[in-house]
Structures are given as structure tokens and as C-alpha cells.
Interface confidence: low
Amino acid sequence: VPRWRQQWSGPGTTKRFPETVLARCVKYTEIHPEMRHVDCQSVWDAFKGAFISKHPCNITEEDYQPLMKLGTQTVPCNKILLWSRIKDLAHQFTQVQRDMFTLEDTLLGYLADDLTWCGEFNTSKINYQSCPDWRKDCSNNPVSVFWKTVSRRFAEAACDVVHVMLNGSRSKIFDKNSTFGSVEVHNLQPEKVQTLEAWVIHGGREDSRDLCQDPTIKELESIISKRNIQFSCKNIYRPDKFLQCVKNPEDSSCTSEI
């Protein structure tokens, strides 16, 4: 008789999840010499231990502590780029500007980027059929808790000037419910972080509005100021040109506003 299985509202664990995590770990440690000491099998075991045999609506940050310990990594605290709803451009930027880092440029962020995972209570099975949706099912699911944990640690590590890339095409350029708005903003350390600089990325070619005056950006400024951190904002009117100018800063067209 087939055992009854909980049907969740979200997509199931990413196909070939264990192989993906392990292979990404191997690849990352090859690319980053400072992480060569990492034992990827132990990393996978710790990752698996965080959610296997546990109810997928009852995951805690504590479950991920063994993985956090193994994935401990020092990134230059003044070279951190946060992002909200504009991951692809943020990643393209750090691919070019190699001395800056998004969360997904760290080992733990890299391992989990674009993946979904969950287990089942009291069995060692990975659930490939469905996983809890953050809104429809529960917020304490394996994926949400993982990103909340690593995002908090990443923000806590930041210092000096922290940059954040925001999507100017969205109705809420700054969204209090995003990971950036609900976790990272509140875990920047005022004694270490001097300024949060927002880069608002424009979508339309002819869009010349000053999106730094958007009400949600003003809301972000208010939250940050109350935390005794300075706030600055820049419009990136031409994201394509912005990337080109990061690659070729000596280009004569890069002196004008982008």
C-alpha cells in the first residue's frame, strides 16, 4: 500500500539535488583557492542533515548551524553587493567586477542558488513531488529558512559602504517583504556599516525619472537612517551601458551619467 504523502503547494525538490549540490561544491572549491580545504562530502552531509527526516514546516536556523560552520567564509566586508528582485544583473555585475560579492558568490549561496529542496518527517526520503510554499503553506520551510539564515549572516558581515541593487521596474522598488527588506536591512551593523548605497536599475530606455525619489526608496532611507546608517541613492538609467562601463571604464562614453 503506497504511503500517504503530504501535497504541498510549491514545486518539489530540484531534480538531481544531491548531485547538484555536491558538484557545485567541488566546482566552487576548485575556482576559489581559499576554500580548497572544504570537504564537499561533509558539506553535503551537513546540508542534508538540516532538512532530512524533519517536518518541512518546522525547520529552524539551528538546523542549518552545522552547514553554516562548514561554509564559513571570509569575504571583504566592504565589497558586498546586496540585491532585491534583480538577481541576474547583480550576478552579471560581480562576474565583471570580480572584487565585489553577492551572497551567491559565496560557497553557501552558490550551492543553493535557484534550487528547491525539502524532506519528509520521519523518513530519509527527499520529496521530489512538492515542497511547502512560503505563502500558501508555511514560512519555516527548508528553503526559506536557509536563505533567511545565510542572508542574515551575510548582512551582519558587511562593513563600510554596502551597495544594494534594486529593480526600478517594479511597483515596489523597495519591498519590505523581500529578503533584503525583511532580513538584510535589519541585520546591517551600524557600528560597522557607514553607508548603504542603493543603485536603482531602470527598465525602460526612455525612462529619465529620478527613481531615487520613489516613496518606497524614501521608506528605505527612513529605515536605514533610524538605524544610524547613512543612505545614498543612484539611478542607473542604462543597465546595459552600466555593465559595459564596468568592463571598460576607460571608454570615453563612460564619463557621462549612466
Partner: antibody, heavy 124, light 108 residues
Framework: QVQLKESGPALVKPTQTLTLTCTFS??????????VGWIRQPPGKALEWLAL???????RYSTSLKTRLTISKDTSKNQVVLTMTNMDPVDTATYYC????????????????WGQGTLVTVSS | DIVLTQSPATLSLSPGERATLSCRAS???????LAWYQQKPGQAPRLLIY???SRATGVPARFSGSGSGTDFTLTISSLEPEDFAVYYC?????????FGQGTKVEIK
Amino acid sequence: QVQLKESGPALVKPTQTLTLTCTFSGFSLSSDGMGVGWIRQPPGKALEWLALIDWDDDKRYSTSLKTRLTISKDTSKNQVVLTMTNMDPVDTATYYCARFNWFYRLAFVNPDVWGQGTLVTVSS
Amino acid sequence: DIVLTQSPATLSLSPGERATLSCRASQSVSSSYLAWYQQKPGQAPRLLIYGASSRATGVPARFSGSGSGTDFTLTISSLEPEDFAVYYCQQGYNSPFTFGQGTKVEIK
């Protein structure tokens, strides 16, 4: 270095089954993150992705051709075999095999090394 | 299936000129999974760009890729004689992994 070579019949009759073999060296299909796929190109036309087999025997196929395609691997021989049933003159093309490898940040990937291709003509 | 539409179909330029090739996806593709290939007559395609913007090994710096979501661009900053060829974009985001129909860069 990584090399792939396609082999199979140059001429196939309509309704027959085509069997193509990709023999490769310089990597192992039992290694995590490796895959071998097939892509074809009719004369003067664009590339068309056909099928992919991964190190863990996971198989994926073109939507329009999946009922006619079967991909398999023999890891010990470093070979991947593609069979395509019910061949038609419109299937005349150069058939390429290619390695699919892992890159920075990726779970699903793009072919990075290709064989030189083999021209298959379908005619009675 | 994700459909990739490349434009223009043909680009007629002179050596030394800048070439801009476009690839538009029918649905959003993570930039991590977008690649560009170069194909010369009688040869197999050669990987130029992966992850939308990363040059493959041995690819000259005059080739660059950019874009995200549904719009991607391959730029050749200054065409060399050996760059005249057909260029294809390809997505590895959703199976089946589709190709664009190609852009031919020809000598004017």
C-alpha cells in the same frame, strides 16, 4: 584533451531507424556534472537540440521528436548512442554530439565541446 | 518550449565595425543559462560566451555578452576578418535546450 567523434551511416532509407554513436575521450560520463547531447543541423539551416544524457542516466529529449528518439550510454566504452526511428527526408542533416559540462553557478548547462559532425542523408 | 528569436537575420558590416546581435526569449531565462556560439561554414559550432557574459577559454576580448530576463546581446567590438560567420544563442535553462535561428554576419 576533450574530443568527441560521431559515427553512423551516411545514407538511410525513409522509414528506417538511424543509429548514431558518439565516442569521446578526455572526460568520463561517470563524473559528476558531465553529460553528452546530440544536436542536428539541416543543410543551410539552424541548429536543433535533440537529446541529452547525464552522468546519472537522466535523459531529456526535444519535445517535437521525443517519440522517435532514444539516447543511451555505455560508460565503460566512453560512448553515447542515439537512435531515431521512422526517418524521413526532412531528417537529412549533420548530426553533432557535444559534451555538456558544469560552469560557474550553473545546474543546467550549455554544450562546450563539439564533435565535427556526421552528415546523414535520408533518401530512397 | 522556450523560443529564442535572433535579430537581425543578416548583418552586413565591414572589418573594424561594431556588431550587435540580439537574442530574445519567449519567456524569462536566467542569464546563467544563456550561451552564444560561432559557426563557420563546414565547421562545428564553437562556444563563445556562457552565463550570458562570460567568455569561454581562448575567446578574444572583442567578444562580449550582456543581458538578462528575455533580452540578450552579443557584441563584437571591432570585427576581424575571421569573425564573419553565423552566431547562435542557446538556452540551457529549461529542457528542451533550444537554439535561436542564427544571425549571419557577412562582409559588406
